[in-house]
């Protein structure tokens, strides 16, 4: 499976930027931080791997976007939406959100001031 290439529309829009980047390393980085050695995630074994692998690639991808509050927030919302169904309980959802909001700081970016991570119709 490949990314959709050359999509029409405003190439500077946050949606277009979020669509072009690979957010999977960010998702795995956060899942590893909150799950540690609990279980295998996707088909990739996160139990014995260093989170720095995912973090470096994650930060590189986030760095590809215009460093605006709105675009960063949209990226964080997309990560939350992508992982929502994997989060087993309310506590895990809250942990994930906490780690997600720390992500820009870990990558030395400005964190969005206000970013609503309640996605998927309130499920998360």
């Amino acid at each position: 499976m490949r990314r959709e290439r050359g999509r029409q529309g405003d190439s500077s829009s946050c949606e277009r930027q979020v669509d072009r980047v690979n957010l999977k390393p960010c998702e795995q980085h956060i899942m590893q931080r909150i799950m540690g050695e609990q279980e295998q995630y996707d088909s990739y074994d996160i139990r014995s791997t260093r989170s720095s692998d995912q973090q470096q690639r994650c930060c590189d991808e986030l760095n590809e976007m215009e460093n605006t509050q709105r675009c960063m927030c949209e990226a964080l919302q997309q990560i939350m939406e992508n992982q929502c169904d994997r989060l087993q309980d309310r506590q895990m959802v809250q942990q994930f959100k906490r780690e997600l909001m720390n992500l820009p700081q870990q990558c030395n970016f400005r964190a969005p001031q206000r970013c609503d991570l309640d996605v998927s119709g309130g499920r998360c």
Epitope: R3, R5, G6, Y44, T49, R50, D53, R57, N63
Partner: antibody
């Protein structure tokens, strides 16, 4: 047809400079990270440098840091490698490679490679 | 820097046999960032496996990848004449994106 074509190789004396180019065609160049990988005669592959789509993130192998500079021009569909202070051990075939990722699971990989351009550093 | 050590250096087998190539990392590598390439003399490398176990487009199912952490394996179930080449593993999660030194698969 998706293609990468390297050029700019040649014979250069130790301490000299060369600029390699890689012309991309058949795909949206600005959508991909790009890499340079080299292979010394009879040796294995050595990753040299990478540059992200917007040029915001650049990495180098320790062996070339401070001497080589990777750059790209998305408007010209071109990747470059400026090589300064060349040494005998820089003699190699230099490959330009496109990096993609699997959108469903995330892994990265170099899926398209050029045929390479030969750099010989010798006095 | 993550050092990848491939073994054996050379593997001599006959067509039809099973080949098992090893790639060991000096530090743990996420499966997500482990790739295998094939290279034949005078040619550019060719992508075989990414994400440690996913076959690239057009790669026959006799090729399979497995492993996690520091130990990864490329297996060719039944060797075809065109499979004799040099195989490289690479990690691309943490810069510098290192390659193993390669395993040469030769006809016995």
């Amino acid at each position: 047809e998706v293609q990468l074509v390297e050029s700019g190789g040649g014979l250069v004396q130790p301490g000299g400079s060369l600029r390699l180019s890689c012309a991309a065609s058949g795909f949206i160049f600005s959508d991909y990270n790009m890499n340079w990988v080299r292979q010394a005669p009879g040796k294995g592959l050595e990753w040299v440098s990478s540059i992200t789509r917007s040029s915001r993130t650049i990495y180098y192998a320790d062996s070339v840091k401070g001497r080589f500079t990777i750059s790209r021009d998305n408007a010209k569909n071109s990747l470059y490698l400026q090589m300064n202070s060349l040494r005998d051990e820089d003699t190699a075939v230099y490959y330009c490679a496109r990096e993609d990722f699997d959108v469903s699971t995330g892994p990265y990989y170099m899926d398209v490679w050029g045929k390479g351009t030969t750099v010989t550093v010798s006095s | 820097e993550i050092v990848l050590t491939q073994s054996p250096g050379t593997l001599s087998l006959s067509p039809g046999e099973r080949a098992t190539l090893s790639c060991r990392a000096s530090q743990s590598v996420s499966n997500m960032f482990l790739v295998w390439y094939q290279q034949k003399p005078g040619q550019a490398p060719r992508l075989l496996i990414y994400g440690a176990s996913t076959r690239a487009t057009g790669i026959p199912d006799r090729f399979s990848g497995s492993g996690s952490g520091t130990d990864f394996t490329l297996t060719i179930s039944r060797l075809e004449p065109e499979d004799f080449a040099v195989y490289y593993c690479q990690q691309n999660g943490n810069s510098p994106y290192t390659f193993g030194q390669g395993t040469k698969l030769e006809i016995k």
